[in-house]
């Protein structure tokens, strides 16, 4: 059993989250995750979900009685979602920490907007990746 | 030329974001995007970037002089990042709007945590997807 399970059960007790009323008005995340099967779509959604949990855990870093549980779960999220890749986790954290009301950040964001937009669609792939796709299509066609 | 380009230039003027000092202390997004080539990694990062822009645009929704530009860019983001898929965009917006300090949301999030974690790693794929991977590996090996 993964380490997070026991600790998540501990958090459930703390938040009284096993209570039947918690299920009122549907789910937050599970229903949405069910809608998306494609890996890249799932990553778009999971990215928001993971950042929500990180914010939630940050919000409760006062509460000593759940600190061990929170740390264990965060570590397990790091393993599962970021493949224990510290650079990936750090870049992600950087993105979640930018302040939307900081003028310097606002100006930088607008400055970078055109280039960011140009890279948004999967079609905006590097020449190398486009080429390897073409080769793969060709190979399949000739099988 | 995509419609967003002209409107992004308009925003650059408004924010005085073409000025040389904007480049001080590195980039917000571009440097991070350069680090990740794998599509699913890119989606993790782009998800945070797009939600940042949405929050930024929301922050400036009072400023009439840039409303047309903002709307055009948002629409183009919708096309590029969500493939004009309204359901995808709506699910994404839902996730970005959950409040981390609402007790009901906190309790639901903790209630769903074990199932969310179980789905985080790409390894947690359905049998069907696993099977198709195996077939593909077999086919490549026999070529």
């Amino acid at each position: 059993q993964d380490p997070y399970v026991k600790e998540a059960e501990n958090l459930k007790k703390y938040f009284n989250a096993g209570h039947s009323d918690v299920a009122d008005n549907g789910t937050l995340f599970l229903g949405i995750l069910k809608n998306w099967k494609e890996e890249s779509d799932r990553k778009i959604m999971q990215s928001q979900i993971v950042s929500f949990y990180f914010k939630l855990f940050k919000n409760f870093k006062d509460d000593q009685s759940i600190q061990k549980s929170v740390e264990t779960i965060k570590e397990d999220m790091n393993v599962k979602f970021f493949n224990s890749n510290k650079k990936k986790r750090d870049d992600f954290e950087k993105l979640t920490n930018y302040s939307v009301t900081d003028l310097n950040v606002q100006r930088k964001a607008i400055h970078e907007l055109i280039q960011v937009m140009a890279e948004l669609s999967p079609a905006a792939k590097t020449g190398k990746r486009k080429r390897s796709q073409m080769l793969f299509r060709g190979r399949r066609a000739s099988q | 030329q995509d419609p967003y380009v002209k409107e992004a230039e308009n925003l650059k003027k408004y924010f005085n974001a073409g000025h040389s000092d904007v480049a001080d202390n590195g980039t917000l997004f571009l440097g991070i995007l350069k680090n990740w080539k794998e599509e699913s990694d890119r989606k993790i990062m782009q998800s945070q970037i797009v939600s940042f822009y949405f929050k930024l645009f929301k922050n400036f929704k009072d400023d009439q002089s840039i409303q047309k530009s903002v709307e055009t860019i948002k629409e183009d983001m919708n096309v590029k990042f969500f493939n004009s898929n309204k359901k995808k965009r709506d699910d994404f917006e839902k996730l970005t709007n959950y409040s981390v300090t609402d007790l009901n949301v906190q309790r639901k999030a903790i209630h769903e945590l074990i199932q969310v974690m179980a789905e985080l790693s790409p390894a947690a794929k359905t049998g069907k997807r696993k099977r198709s991977q195996m077939l593909f590996r077999g086919r490549r090996a026999s070529q």
Epitope: K61, Q64 | L103
Partner: nanobody
Framework: AVQLVESGGGLVQTGDSLRLSCVAS????????MGWFRQAPGKEREFVAR????????SYATSVEGRFAISRDNAKNTVYLQMNSLKPEDTAVYYC?????????????WGQGTQVTVSS
């Protein structure tokens, strides 16, 4: 034992603001989480907001999220509830409470309450 004294209640119009205060004595204020609860006529006492010992760990009832803000000043042994955009359904007696260590919103000591009335 901890003593808690609330103040700041009153009669206001819909859309107005009020700031409730709660002064604690008889304990180490900075060591425990604090909460606000309310009881409307003929209803059970319900949770409104809570704040951890250092001013983090904040939770709000869904009905007040975005309108009310809880804060604390450990130097003054005081917890506050800033109530904005008040509605008639916010009418209640508001109680301040210290919270049991290791629980999210289980109270151990209560103040005597302060009345808030919102007229339409």
């Amino acid at each position: 034992a901890v003593q808690l004294v609330e103040s700041g209640g009153g009669l206001v119009q819909t859309g107005d603001s009020l700031r409730l205060s709660c002064v604690a004595s008889g304990g180490t204020f900075s060591r425990y989480a604090m909460g606000w609860f309310r009881q409307a006529p003929g209803k059970e006492r319900e949770f409104v907001a809570r704040i951890g010992y250092s001013g983090r760990s904040i939770s709000y009832a869904t009905s007040v999220e975005g309108r009310f803000a809880i804060s604390r000043d450990n130097a003054k042994n005081t917890v506050y509830l800033q109530m904005n955009s008040l509605k008639p359904e916010d009418t209640a007696v508001y109680y301040c409470a210290s919270l049991v260590s290791g629980t999210l919103y289980q109270a151990d000591y209560w103040g005597q309450g302060t009345q808030v009335t919102v007229s339409s």
